[in-house]
Interface confidence: low
């Protein structure tokens, strides 16, 4: 077969070829940051020709044009300077009202180097209608100038731009615009990551609730759904495995739908996710009505053996099938609970549509929708019950009109997307889902994007202050109680001085919080085995401290997951029935257990916590220490087993006021608190006014560093005789 | 933590069927987490994977082994056991149990070394 | 069936860097996995999904996947990690395992 030639060269970019210079290869060109290429593509014709897709003349020299945004076309009650055709990259547009006038949005909006807007469309309303004034997007047309009940707004784009969001909205009863903001756009634009995972995300959280069936209350969280023990969701996952799509942008859509899955499963909800690639036709790799959908083990088995050349004999884009796919496994579960039932009908179904190309065989989408719709009764009650997600990959050949009309229509909400590569692709299925944001008490979630702040990846420590010394930390467990150590407190019991520091989004410094009561518990004594040459003994170093108020989960305050409770249980995903055993069996697995601390300047540090024969060997280094045990014959003396044990090898070491602060280890996208550091051999910040600085210690240090925290599966009684009322346990 | 022990003849006889059982403590064998596996290492060779089993027992074998090779859970005893008929000398090898979590090998048994006598 | 071709020794002088590679047709649309086996011990899980890292496997450990050939370096060679490594795919719902490398540490 004729090659097609290389000749294709773009000034100012690069390009890749998806299948070599072979007929059916896709040329993709791509330019810097705030340059477009033009055309986009190139595909090898059988003639050994290239085709410019959508061209109608001849073969032009490929270049990188300048991106630009669109100008406003129109702007009610009001004025916007400068007044330009279109904005280059890094221009500004800025927004005045008249007299009379309130400007909501943003007053000033600068160009970004992938040609949208940031910031909010500016309106300048007076407040008079039912809804409030919908806006005119830049680059946008607007019909229609009454705000009433029932009434009907209409937009168009101007020029070339690409219309997406709803181009008809209807002012509701609520006084809330139906479907979503119009955007106009330029054809080659895409979304950033960064702009998609939390639009995504939002959308997402708010059908999946991740609410925690413990609760005994629900507050509401947007159009957030309760998906409870009853409520299922269904998941398909539709991969775009036609012939414009690389083998290598494959392995990512793969990646990145393994990430969503995994995601998925950590919510607290019951989830079936179904798996179909798609070229020319469909192939089904996991169906909702197979059990081991809902096993996700199971469901990333089968994305992980999806394989790129099953569909090598028919390479086209053929949407339609993919989606009547997912209707007819629709159709099937209907027929198999009954239409008539609640287990059918308080399914909620999420289609996420993964492709980097247009359809361009098998007929509409849009009809595979539509039946879909049908199918599952969606009207304005149960608008809920559907979220389509179509989220284009690659600049080349998506096509904006497809994709926004397959995408659901929700206010404050967007379902449809373009980024520019799987890469970014993958950036957004690792961020998007942040349950973080909710409001209920949820245990055991940290925000685990690259940008959050320390705070946010551990909401749940605290920080204890006494009126003199030396500080502790702790960690939240509900909304009113914090575990810390118990030596915290042994200079006497008045704690009406002492302070508890808690995260909060408001301030950096977080919001403090007064004691109402102390519970230390009555084993511990540090003078307990003095008489036995054994200065100081830190048996039973716990307590619980019961704030005076109760905290407002946030971002930045949240408890942590404590094992053998019914909330830690639905946290691992456990069966009902599971036991406290069978926890420790799960969190403490390995001879050496990853694990986590937080350092007094608020990072994360790294232990392993040593189990079985290697604790032995972790704790026999006590038998060293001379100064402080001078006649120890029994390490055992000392570190009974109520103690974990870590400080070898690359492990950091706390330093001395990071103690009543966490152990923890992470399960599931989730956070659970298995110790809490209690006392060491070797203080790393000895001598350091500075909190970022720790001296490890020498390779030479006689005793090496050793750390011990309290093992809360050793503490389980004295936990649930104070917390009984608090959480939930589960039987030993 | 999960710990994996083979168990089984250290020989058996050419043609007959080796029989392993491979009992796994430190977490339920049915957790949908998991998933279970046998691979062999033939004297001074490599690794050769044998087969795996899932929860649900959805099973995989190497093709290799043209149907020889039967993979079971017994979730009750908490183990999981591989059947190989018709053996022949070149099945000797040492014979690791492994448990995987996503697609990957992370807990092995210590192995077990099968002889196939004639 | 799918082949994954490995050296069959690589030597590396203490303190120095070791690569070993395994080789497989378009093996970059493949997620890599990397095992360590001491001599008569179990194999243990050194690198997954090409270049992630098992909690516990230090640093020095890393892993890269390219075209037709996947990467296990190890930085810094210590003799502890004289053993034999094999590279491991999934292919078409089978596991395949490379040939294995022994590396000597000089």
């Known amino acids: 077969a004729p090659s097609c030639p290389q000749n294709v060269n773009i000034s100012g970019g690069t390009f890749t070829l998806s299948h070599g210079w072979a007929p059916g290869s896709l040329l993709t060109y791509s330019c810097p940051q705030g340059l477009y290429p033009s055309p986009a593509s190139r595909l090898c014709k059988s003639s050994g020709q290239w085709q410019t897709p959508g061209a109608t003349r001849s073969l032009s020299k490929a270049v990188c044009k300048p991106v630009r945004c669109p100008a406003p076309v129109s702007f009610e009650n009001g004025i916007y300077t400068p007044r330009l055709g279109s904005y280059p990259v890094g221009g500004n547009v800025s927004f005045e009202c008249e007299d009379g006038f309130i400007l909501r949005g943003s007053p000033v909006r600068q160009c970004r180097p992938n040609g949208m807007w940031d910031g909010e469309t500016a309106v300048c309303d007076n407040g008079a209608g039912h809804c409030p004034n919908p806006g005119i997007s830049l680059g946008a047309v607007r019909t229609g100038f009454r705000f009433g009940h029932g009434d009907k707004v209409r937009y168009r784009c101007s020029s070339n731009l690409v219309l997406t969001g709803s181009s008809e909205r209807e002012c509701q009863g609520n006084g809330v615009w139906s479907g979503t903001e119009p955007i106009c756009r330029q054809p080659y634009s895409y979304d950033f990551p960064e702009d998609v995972a939390p639009a995504l995300g939002t959308s997402f959280s708010h059908m999946l609730g991740a609410t925690n069936p413990t609760q005994k209350t629900k507050e509401s969280l947007g159009r957030k759904i309760q998906i409870q023990r009853s409520g299922h969701l269904n998941l398909y996952l539709l991969l775009d495995c036609s012939q414009s799509v690389s083998e290598n942008d494959f392995l990512i859509f793969k990646e990145s739908a393994s990430l969503m899955v995994d995601r998925i499963f950590s919510f607290e909800i019951n989830v079936s996710v179904a798996i179909i690639t798609f070229a020319s036709e469909p192939k089904v790799l996991m169906s909702v009505l197979n059990d081991n959908s809902r096993d996700m083990t199971e469901v990333i088995s089968s994305l992980e053996n999806a394989n790129y050349k099953d569909h090598e004999n028919g390479t086209g884009t053929n949407t339609y099938a993919a989606l009547n796919s997912v209707y007819l496994m629709m159709n099937n579960q209907m027929r198999l609970l009954g239409m008539e039932t609640m287990a059918w009908q308080e399914i909620r179904h999420a289609i996420i549509l993964l492709t980097d190309g247009k359809s361009n065989m098998g007929g509409s989408p849009k009809t595979a929708v539509d039946h879909i719709r049908e199918i599952l009764n969606i009207n304005q009650k149960r608008n809920d019950y559907l979220d389509i997600y179509a989220i284009g990959v690659g600049k080349l050949d998506v096509d904006w009109r497809e994709l926004n009309e397959l995408g659901s229509k929700k206010d404050g909400e967007r379902h449809a997307f373009i980024l520019q590569d799987t890469k970014a692709l993958h950036q957004v299925f690792e961020h998007m889902l942040d349950v973080s944001k909710l409001t209920d008490t949820i245990c055991g979630v940290g925000n685990m994007s690259a940008n959050a702040s320390d705070q946010e990846r551990t909401p749940w420590h605290v920080t204890i202050k006494p009126k003199s010394q030396e500080t502790c930390r702790g960690a939240l467990i509900s909304d009113q109680w914090v575990l810390t150590a118990a030596h915290c407190f042994r200079d006497g019991n008045d704690h009406s001085l002492w302070r508890v520091n808690v995260g909060d989004p408001k301030s950096q410094w977080g919001k403090e919080f007064l004691i109402e009561k102390a519970v230390i518990s009555p084993g511990f004594d540090v003078f307990a085995k003095k008489n036995q040459g054994i200065l100081e003994f830190y048996g039973d170093d716990i307590a619980l401290l019961k704030l005076a108020q109760k905290v407002k989960m946030s971002t930045h305050a949240r408890p942590i997951c404590l094992p053998c409770t019914m909330e830690a249980n639905l946290a691992l995903r456990r069966p009902q029935g599971s036991t406290c055993r069978d926890h420790e069996n799960e969190l403490l697995n390995k001879q050496s257990v990853p694990a986590h601390f937080v350092a007094l300047n608020g990072s994360k540090l790294n232990i392993n916590l040593k189990m079985g024969v290697e604790w032995t060997s972790c704790a026999e280094v006590v038998s060293q220490e001379k100064t402080m045990f001078p006649n120890l014959t029994d390490v055992r003396e000392v570190v009974t087993d109520q103690f974990l044990c870590s400080g070898t090898q690359e492990d950091e070491s706390p330093c001395k006021g990071e103690s009543g602060g966490a152990v923890f280890l992470e399960r599931r996208f989730r956070f659970f608190q298995v110790g809490l550091v209690s006392w060491g051999l070797y203080n790393p910040c000895l001598g350091s006014a500075d909190k970022n600085s720790r001296k490890r210690a020498p390779r030479s240090k006689v005793p090496p560093p050793r750390d011990f925290h309290i093992n809360l599966f050793r503490m389980q009684p004295w936990l649930r005789q104070h917390l009984g009322d608090v959480l939930n346990f589960l039987p030993l | 933590q999960l710990q994996l022990q083979e168990s089984g003849p250290g020989l058996v006889k050419s043609s007959e069927t080796l029989s392993l059982t491979c009992t796994v403590s430190g977490g339920p064998i049915s957790s949908s987490s998991y998933y279970w596996g046998w691979i062999r290492q033939p004297p001074g060779k490599g690794l050769e994977w044998i087969g795996t089993i899932y929860y649900s027992g959805r099973t995989y074998y190497n093709p290799s082994l043209k149907s020889r090779g039967t993979i079971s859970v017994g979730t009750s005893k908490n183990q999981f056991s591989l059947k190989l008929s018709s053996v022949t000398a070149a099945d000797t090898a040492v014979f690791y149990c492994a448990g995987g979590v996503g697609v990957t090998w992370d807990y092995w048994g210590q192995g077990t070394l099968v002889t196939v006598s004639s | 069936s799918y082949d994954l071709s490995q050296p069959l020794s690589v030597s590396v002088a203490l303190g120095q860097t070791a690569r070993i590679t395994c080789g497989g047709n378009d093996i970059e649309s493949k997620n890599v996995h990397w095992y360590q086996q001491r001599p008569g011990q179990a194999p243990v899980l050194v690198i997954y999904?090409?270049?992630n890292r098992p909690s516990g496997i230090p640093e020095r450990f890393s892993g890269s996947n390219s075209g037709n050939t996947a990467t296990l370096t190890i930085s810094r060679g210590q003799g502890g990690d004289e053993a034999d490594y094999y590279c491991q795919v999934w292919d078409s719902s089978t596991v395949i395992f490379g040939g294995g490398t022994k590396l000597t540490v000089l």
């Open positions: 999904r090409n270049s």
